[in-house]
Amino acid sequence: APVRSLNCTLRDSQQKSLVMSGPYELKALHLQGQDMEQQVVFSMSFVQGEESNDKIPVALGLKEKNLYLSCVLKDDKPTLQLESVDPKNYPKKKMEKRFVFNKIEINNKLEFESAQFPNWYISTSQAENMPVFLGGTKGGQDITDFTMQFVSS
């Protein structure tokens, strides 16, 4: 069976939107009006992995682009990147672990924990116009809480 996917946008708990920053990076900034069209639309695929009531494994692709968020070690540090894939083979139900995030719902907010690096989360900073990254703390000054807005396909 084909993998189930939905289209969505994400905003952090400060209401910053996510946009492309160069070819292989996302950044977070406040958008309004027509600028909202800049925000990236994700194709969130529900993939194989450890699942519970509030924890669902997903892959985050960029809609109509063969790019997926992935988590890899760079200079011995877990790092978030946009990785190019062969569109003929993705998305798939059994995604490689670097592409998998545990979508965790807490109090109507979402966290995205790396399956490859437990306790590392998709993060934004308080500052405007700075990259989205993989952070190793929750509840500190880095932002790990997001809301999801559904986009019709």
């Epitope: 920053s21 160069g22 990076e25 950044k27 900034l29 540090k77 993060s123 900073s125 308080q126 500052a127 405007e128 116009n129 700075m130 990259p131 990254f133 993989l134 952070g135 190793g136 703390t137 500190g140 000054q141 880095d142």
Partner: antibody
């Protein structure tokens, strides 16, 4: 008053290492992104590296990637740049700068000179 | 990487002149552009951020305009302390990049 004071520059042979420090005062260091920017003698400005307040997000210019490492100690209000495998073309005044709104450098240190020569 | 091209690379002007410096980005950077002033032996000083916003404490004779790929820094009525080198810098994406500089000399 915001102050940034770089130290650690000097003369080093090609292939050698150096660690620059930047002592910050007059603002809440732990809340700000920080940059290193360099300027070769008689040349323009070149961005080198950035680090987020928590230290989890770092980025580097291609010219220093794999050789330089940016870090910070928020308890000491200090920014660092570890420079390995130094080359003649790394000779420059190195400035640390506080990152302002959207990615500009709103305060700069006075700079420290790094000379790579045999 | 985004290339930033400044023109002119140098210019001679007199006190009281109105001066315009141009900065072009190799791709759209929205309004994520800053301008700096640097005098010999000193660190750069931020003049303008977000293309048009005057940094606190900077005289109002300095102004910035533009968005997308084309930006200008204008100095109305040059003062003796304005003879310096000016740099633009894009903050749209990493790696951040600077223009090559514009040296403003006394005619």
């Amino acid at each position: 008053e915001v102050q940034l004071l770089e130290s650690g520059g000097g003369l080093v042979q090609p292939g050698g290492s150096l660690r620059l420090s930047c002592a910050a005062s007059g603002f809440t260091f732990s809340k700000y992104f920080m940059f290193w920017v360099r300027q070769a003698p008689g040349k323009g400005l070149e961005w080198v590296s950035v680090i987020s307040p928590s230290g989890f997000m770092t980025r580097y210019a291609d010219s220093v990637k794999g050789r330089f490492t940016i870090s910070r100690d928020n308890s000491k209000n200090t920014l660092y740049l570890q420079m390995n495998s130094l080359r003649a073309e790394d000779t420059a005044v190195y400035y640390c700068a506080r990152v302002g709104y959207g990615g500009n450098s709103d305060y700069w240190g006075q700079g420290t000179l790094v000379t790579v020569s045999s | 990487d985004i290339q930033m091209t400044q023109s002119p690379s140098s210019v001679s002007a007199s006190v009281g002149d109105r001066l315009t410096i141009i900065c072009r980005a190799s791709q759209d950077i929205n309004r994520w552009l800053a301008w700096y002033q640097q005098t010999p032996g000193n660190a750069p000083k931020l003049l303008i951020h977000s293309a048009t916003s005057l940094q606190s404490g900077v005289p109002s004779r300095f102004s910035g305009s533009g968005s997308g790929t084309d930006f200008t820094l204008t100095i109305n009525s040059l003062q003796p302390e304005d003879f310096a080198t000016y740099y633009c810098q894009q903050a749209d994406s990493f790696p951040l990049t600077f223009g090559g500089g514009t040296k403003v000399e006394i005619k």
